[in-house]
């Protein structure tokens, strides 16, 4: 996150860190006790079974009693994900156990299926453990920045016509650099307490207003998300699972 600030520890309890070989790699968010949403591109060249998901974290390098760590039992990328265009850049990670909900670990609500994205100018927040500058500086803890929704047609023009309707864009609202950066991918864009966007890609420089930040528009995938979750729930399961609605 560039141009942002460190959040109060555990004030974004839905945040998940996806790590490989002990290093944070992508973000994600908890929508169900067994499921985290992340970005499909995070697993284009990585074996999901080698990854770990950490919940309840603030400073990833510090051992915190609130942290819950899971391996990835299954990773379900959207069947129409296109690495060449980043279209349908969304993935569901099934945890190998059930998250224990509490003050530091909570679910994030999704938008209603096929809901219109927030109007242009709406203030939203994006958070993550990604770099805080183009120098690839790691953050001291979970970071967040306020951004504004940008009209998709304006954004598509800035991006030279590369976007599709299932994407969402934000900008700083001024000429300052504010937005997400490398390793924030998969994290949520939260507007009105719901995950309306999922961090997908940005331009040559983090937070550059000339190439606005691009997200997967979550509302376009709500049906698919719950279809996957439902299909994987074993009929004979006695364990109580909770989902955000």
């Amino acid at each position: 996150i560039v141009g942002g600030h460190e959040v109060t520890p555990h004030s974004r309890p839905y945040m998940a860190s996806v790590s490989f070989e002990g290093h944070h790699y992508c973000g994600g968010f908890l929508i169900h006790t067994h499921w985290v949403v992340s970005a499909a591109h995070c697993f284009s060249d990585r074996d999901p079974s080698m990854g770990l998901v950490v919940l309840g974290a603030h400073a990833l390098l510090a051992p915190e009693p609130t942290q819950q760590t899971f391996s990835i039992a299954a990773a379900v990328s959207h069947p129409d994900f296109q690495p060449a265009t980043q279209a349908n850049d969304i993935c569901l990670l099934r945890l190998n156990g059930s998250a224990v909900l509490g003050p530091a670990v909570r679910l994030l609500r999704l938008p209603r299926r096929n809901a219109k994205p927030p109007a242009a100018g709406t203030r939203c927040h994006v958070s993550g453990w990604g770099f805080v500058s183009d120098f690839e500086e790691p953050p001291p803890g979970l970071m967040e920045v306020e951004v504004r929704i940008l009209d998709l047609s304006v954004c598509n023009s800035s991006w030279q016509g590369q976007l599709n309707p299932a994407m969402l864009c934000t900008h700083s609202g001024d000429r300052r650099r504010r937005g997400f950066c490398s390793a924030d991918s998969g994290g949520p864009l939260v507007c009105g307490r719901r995950a309306h966007g999922l961090v997908s890609f940005s331009g040559l420089w983090c937070g550059d207003p000339k190439t606005p930040d691009v997200y997967t528009q979550v509302s376009a995938f709500v049906t698919w998300i719950w279809d996957v979750v439902r299909a994987s729930s074993s009929p004979g399961s006695t364990g109580r699972s909770v989902r955000a609605v």
Partner: antibody
Framework: EVQLVESGGGLVQPGGSLRLSCAAS????????IHWVRQAPGKGLEWVAW????????YYADSVKGRFTISADTSKNTAYLQMNSLRAEDTAVYYC????????????WGQGTLVTVSS | DIQMTQSPSSLSASVGDRVTITCRAS??????VAWYQQKPGKAPKLLIY???FLYSGVPSRFSGSGSGTDFTLTISSLQPEDFATYYC?????????FGQGTKVEIK
């Protein structure tokens, strides 16, 4: 050792096409953006195009937008520049370059390949 | 697009001289400026990034300074191998843009 080697340059008629390649070694594409920069004979440097580390997004100079396409094959660690509808003013040495950090600068450059557009 | 204007366009100097090249951006680019050296027939080489950071392996006689719109590349004591063309480049907002170059020649 990081190396970038361009190939594919040559003489082409106006309106013609050419595909340049940039073979990389000593680093992986998935960790670094790749750029093409050109230099017309006796002139300065002009940035042409960029492809992100994932290969999922691209950006072009206005002068080549709609005519040039940058792409990458991460399995081959090779980037490409497909140049269509070539014009005389596209005549230049074309360099591919690797990003330092998150595109802070271009820290490694290839030796360049000459493209001449002439009838 | 941001315009980068270098001055002078060329200069003559002797070995041992202190040489200063300036670059002015058409709008605020913070410290997002790099400097390159290019010799005839060769690819550019990175000298300085983010206005003042010396790139690995570059001799300490090269230094950079500035922020906002005005930037400077200084060679404290010119060496024979420093005769070349120098370019500044902004990496603040897309697209990246270069200055027109400054040719440093032997007096």
């Amino acid at each position: 050792e990081v190396q970038l080697v361009e190939s594919g340059g040559g003489l082409v008629q106006p309106g013609g096409s050419l595909r340049l390649s940039c073979a990389a070694s000593g680093f992986t594409f998935s960790g670094s953006g790749i750029h093409w920069v050109r230099q017309a004979p006796g002139k300065g440097l002009e940035w042409v195009a960029w492809i992100s580390p994932t290969g999922g997004n691209t950006y072009y100079a206005d002068s080549v937008k709609g005519r040039f396409t940058i792409s990458a094959d991460t399995s081959k660690n090779t980037a490409y520049l497909q140049m269509n509808s070539l014009r005389a003013e596209d005549t230049a040495v074309y360099y591919c370059a690797k990003s330092l950090f998150h595109n802070v600068a271009f820290d490694y450059w290839g030796q360049g390949t000459l493209v001449t557009v002439s009838s | 697009d941001i315009q980068m204007t270098q001055s002078p366009s060329s200069l003559s100097a002797s070995v041992g001289d202190r040489v200063t090249i300036t670059c002015r951006a058409s709008q605020d680019v913070s410290t997002a400026v790099a400097w390159y050296q290019q010799k005839p027939g060769k690819a550019p080489k990175l000298l300085i990034y983010s206005a003042s950071f010396l790139y690995s392996g570059v001799p300490s006689r090269f230094s950079g300074s500035g922020s906002g719109t005005d930037f400077t590349l200084t060679i404290s004591s010119l060496q024979p191998e420093d005769f070349a063309t120098y370019y500044c480049q902004q990496s603040y907002t897309a697209p990246p843009t270069f200055g027109q170059g400054t040719k440093v020649e032997i007096k």
